[in-house]
């Protein structure tokens, strides 16, 4: 029989390769029986995840599971890292694996002098 | 409940590609990894490679760079490998697993039955 | 690669009694995150694989308590407590801390 425990279906390794200025959501899907859990997300540093208070969320309701997003809008660049979910259920506090955004700087990238621009300075 | 399903068997030409698949029904492949294993006859089993349907990332054992490639058709709820310039070595069973994670970390969960595929002329 | 070497190769072993299987990684399976992904697998005669143990000693649902896992770091051990016909097969560990994910070269365990 199904198990009615809160399960965080985020991949481990799984890695998200995204543009600064793009607009990008980080999906954690849960999957739940009766009561929906309180759900938040995190950012790796080091060994500690930090709680991500001020960032906007929503959900995101399907037929078999639910996805808590963490909106970026835009990506910046020191968006780039780990990202963790957790859920609070039956005072249980039940983690994800951690994902891992890779953030190019397109802006950046295409603000270096071009070759022509080099040879004329 | 999830099954995977490949086909029987393919006799293939020295020199030539073929394109193994392997559809999953009861699960949404989007929310796992998709791995490909290779079994010679009477020998141990080798993973080639997985892919994550939900945005195509894949990771191959280098040995099998070059050799293998990883698709997947979320649509159609497919995963594919196709192996290139086939020879006596690749005669093998090669296997496809459903690997999902939950917060209880499951993985390598469900696995098809094999494709035994012969290469000879 | 994270060299997987398990002994014995064959193991015969008579209806009813215990059975022990080694593996043995060529470095530590404890990931960053703490847990050691060492996972054993049977695959029966004429079949596909089939997992048994995850984490070193989590039972996969519907798999008898005969069987338990047991080890960390490099050394890791299956035991089956009284042996059945149904066990039958070649045992395989697994790891999938380290890429590229590896297999032990199998045990066949065999009815005496």
């Known amino acids: 029989k199904e198990s009615c425990d809160v399960q965080l279906y985020i991949k481990r390794q799984s890695e998200h390769s995204i543009l600064a200025g793009d607009p990008f959501e980080l999906e954690c899907p849960v999957k739940y029986c009766a009561n929906r859990p309180h759900v938040t997300w995190c950012k790796l540093n080091g060994t500690t995840c930090v709680k991500l208070e001020d960032r906007q969320t929503s959900w995101k309701e399907e037929k078999n599971i639910s996805f808590f997003i963490l909106h970026f809008e835009p990506v910046l660049p020191n968006d780039n890292g780990s990202y963790r979910c957790s859920a609070n259920f039956q005072s249980n506090l039940i983690e994800s694996h951690s994902t891992t955004l890779y953030v190019t700087d397109v802006k950046s990238a295409s603000e270096r002098p071009s070759k022509d621009e080099m040879a004329s300075r | 409940e999830v099954q995977l399903q490949q086909s029987v068997a393919e006799l293939v030409r020295p020199g030539a590609s073929v394109k193994l698949s392997c559809t999953a029904s009861?699960?949404?492949?989007?929310?796992?990894?998709m791995h490909w294993v290779k079994q010679r006859p009477e020998q141990g089993l080798e993973w080639i490679g997985r892919i994550d349907p939900a945005n195509g990332n894949t990771k191959y054992d280098p040995k099998f760079q070059g050799k293998a490639t990883i698709t997947a058709d979320t649509s159609s709820n497919t995963a594919y490998v196709q192996l290139s310039s086939l020879t006596s070595e690749d005669t093998a069973i090669y296997y496809c697993?459903?690997?999902?994670?939950?917060?209880?970390?499951?993985?390598?969960?469900?696995w098809g039955q094999g494709t035994t595929l012969t290469v000879s002329s | 690669d994270v060299v997987m070497t398990q002994t014995p190769l064959t193991l015969s072993v008579t209806i009813g009694q215990p059975a022990s299987i080694s593996c043995k990684s060529s470095?530590?399976?404890?990931?960053?995150?703490?847990?050691?992904?060492l996972n054993w697998l049977l695959q029966r005669p004429g079949q596909s694989p089939k997992r048994l143990i995850y984490?070193?000693?989590k039972l996969d649902s519907g798999v008898p308590d005969r069987f338990t896992g047991s080890g960390s770091g490099t050394d890791f051990t299956l035991k089956i407590s009284r042996v059945e016909a149904e066990d039958l097969g070649v045992y395989y560990c697994w790891q999938d801390t380290h890429f590229p994910q590896t297999f032990g070269g199998g045990t066949k365990l065999e009815i005496k």
């Open positions: 984490l070193v000693s």
């Open positions: 009861g699960f949404n492949i989007k929310n796992t990894y």
């Open positions: 470095q530590s399976l404890l990931d960053s995150d703490g847990k050691t992904y």
């Open positions: 697993a459903l690997t999902y994670y939950g917060s209880s970390q499951h993985y390598f969960d469900y």
